[in-house]
């Protein structure tokens, strides 16, 4: 015969734990029931009654299966300088991160401690990782037959128009420019941009920064803004 | 509140070395990035550099990175910065800072230590 | 560095006159600008920081505009209490740096 299932409260079999989304209560030695993410414990269990659980008020919440007898508080609000990624819920704290065209350099738990400038890769050198929240730009010098005249933190390097006869080659910032005749392909006008990180699409009422520099970072342990690729603007 | 409490004036010789303590009180001492910048007499102020108590991250200013040195003693909330090699130029106030968000614009000082080098 | 140069070096206002301070950075610093106010004796005190945002309990005479490389700070009406050094710094990148200062005194 199948084990009876023992329903909360009940005391557990010597040297055994209590089930998953349990808990054992030392007051009362038995196993009892968690809250769910979002609840609290509004009544511990007892020898005879299992936990009360209670959702949690605004602007507090619990992450995770719990017992705790109040909710976590959220953060405070956004300053006007961050973007909220993650708004309060019961069951989640409010994230915020660095506004667009900043990346977190030095991350805390929920949010950023330090937020730096994406760096911008100058002509001649393009995109070859874009920056994500937690992340900066990489640069990388255009390989031959590409370029790029820009300096930004999305272009990329692209092929130089191929020309029927050449008035200037191009070089890796500078596209090719071809005699009046028109050139057997050519690309369609404008910079190839690779898609902006998270942070940078949010909508925001500050200006957005547009950095010409990269952070000129000097001795940093881990964590930290990485130093300037090559290629990328700055000292 | 937060209060940033630097210790007291210091006279030392040139080549000497300086440590200039800054105690932490009001906020979670490892939750904030703590910088510091100097101010020689009647001049403008120099950023120094940061450092991070949480987990000993560190950025110093390229002018300063072979003298200075900045550590913490978490157990007591204070940020710590050593200056050596010690020269006349280097007389001046030194400020410890933070910033409370992730942006670094200053907006808790210390009261600042008075540090004379000479001969 | 991205240097950042202040004027003019100083300044005399009459009372309740408008005074302007500039600052001038030498590469694109965004609006990641931020204005001090220092007393003698006293370390600086935050007033602005994101060119034009005003820090907590900072008096609404004070106001910041510019953008990219040039930056002003405005006092609309100067009060006695304002005779003091005004620092520009940019926060934009390390290293972190400061105008030179500009002294506002009374005419």
């Known amino acids: 015969l199948p084990a009876q299932v023992a329903f909360t409260p009940y005391a557990p079999e010597p040297g055994s734990t209590c089930r998953l989304r349990e808990y054992y209560d030392q007051t009362a030695q038995m196993c009892c029931s968690k809250c769910s993410p979002g609840q609290h414990a509004k009544v511990f269990c007892t020898k005879t009654s299992d936990t009360v659980c209670d959702s949690c008020e605004d602007s507090t919440y619990t992450q995770l299966w719990n017992w705790v007898p109040e909710c976590l508080s959220c953060g405070s609000r956004c300053s006007s300088d961050q973007v909220e990624t993650q708004a309060c819920t019961r069951e989640q704290n409010r994230i915020c991160t660095c506004r667009p065209g900043w990346y977190c350099a030095l991350s805390k738990q929920e949010g950023c401690r330090l937020c730096a400038p994406l760096r911008k890769c100058r002509p001649g050198f393009g995109v070859a990782r874009p920056g994500t929240e937690t992340s900066d730009v990489v640069c990388k010098p255009c390989a031959p037959g590409t370029f790029s005249n820009t300096t930004s933190s999305t272009d990329i390097c692209r092929p130089h128009q191929i020309c029927n006869v050449v008035a200037i080659p191009g070089n890796a910032s500078m596209d090719a420019v071809c005699t009046s005749t028109s050139p057997t392909r050519s690309m369609a006008p404008g910079a190839v941009h690779l898609p902006q990180p998270v942070s940078t699409r949010s909508q925001h009422t500050q200006p957005t920064p547009e950095p010409s520099t990269a952070p000129s970072t000097s001795f940093l342990l881990p964590m930290g803004p990485s130093p300037p690729a090559e290629g990328s603007t700055g000292d | 509140q937060v209060q940033l409490v630097q210790s007291g004036a210091e006279v030392k010789k040139p080549g000497a070395s300086v440590k200039v303590s800054c105690k932490a009180s009001?906020?979670?001492?490892?939750?904030?990035?703590i910088h510091w910048v100097r101010q020689a007499t009647g001049q403008g102020l120099e950023w120094m550099g940061w450092?991070?108590?949480?987990?000993?991250?560190?950025n110093y200013n390229e002018k300063f990175k072979d003298r200075v040195t900045m550590t913490r003693n978490t157990s007591i909330s204070t940020a710590y910065m050593e200056l050596s090699s010690l020269r006349s130029e280097d007389t001046a106030v030194y400020y410890c800072?933070?910033?409370?968000?992730?942006?670094?614009?200053?907006?808790?000082w210390g009261q600042g230590t008075t540090v004379t080098v000479s001969s | 560095d991205i240097v950042m140069t202040q004027s003019p070096d100083s300044l005399a206002v009459s009372l309740g006159e408008r005074a302007t301070i500039n600052c001038k950075a030498s590469?694109?610093?965004?609006?990641?600008v931020a204005w001090y106010q220092q007393k003698p004796g006293q370390p600086p005190k935050l007033l602005i920081y994101?060119?034009?945002t005003r820090h907590t309990g900072v008096p609404d005479r004070f106001s910041g505009s510019g953008s990219g490389t040039d930056f002003t700070l405005t006092i609309s009406s100067l009060q006695a209490e304002d005779v003091a050094v005004y620092y520009c710094?940019?926060?934009?990148?390390?290293?972190?740096?400061f105008g030179q200062g500009t002294k506002l005194e009374i005419k």
């Open positions: 009001g906020y979670t001492f490892t939750e904030s990035i």
């Open positions: 800072a933070r910033h409370e968000g992730p942006y670094v614009y200053f907006d808790y």
């Open positions: 450092f991070y108590p949480g987990s000993d991250n560190i």
């Open positions: 590469q694109d610093v965004s609006t990641a």
């Open positions: 710094q940019h926060h934009y990148s390390t290293p972190y740096t």
């Open positions: 994101w060119t034009s």
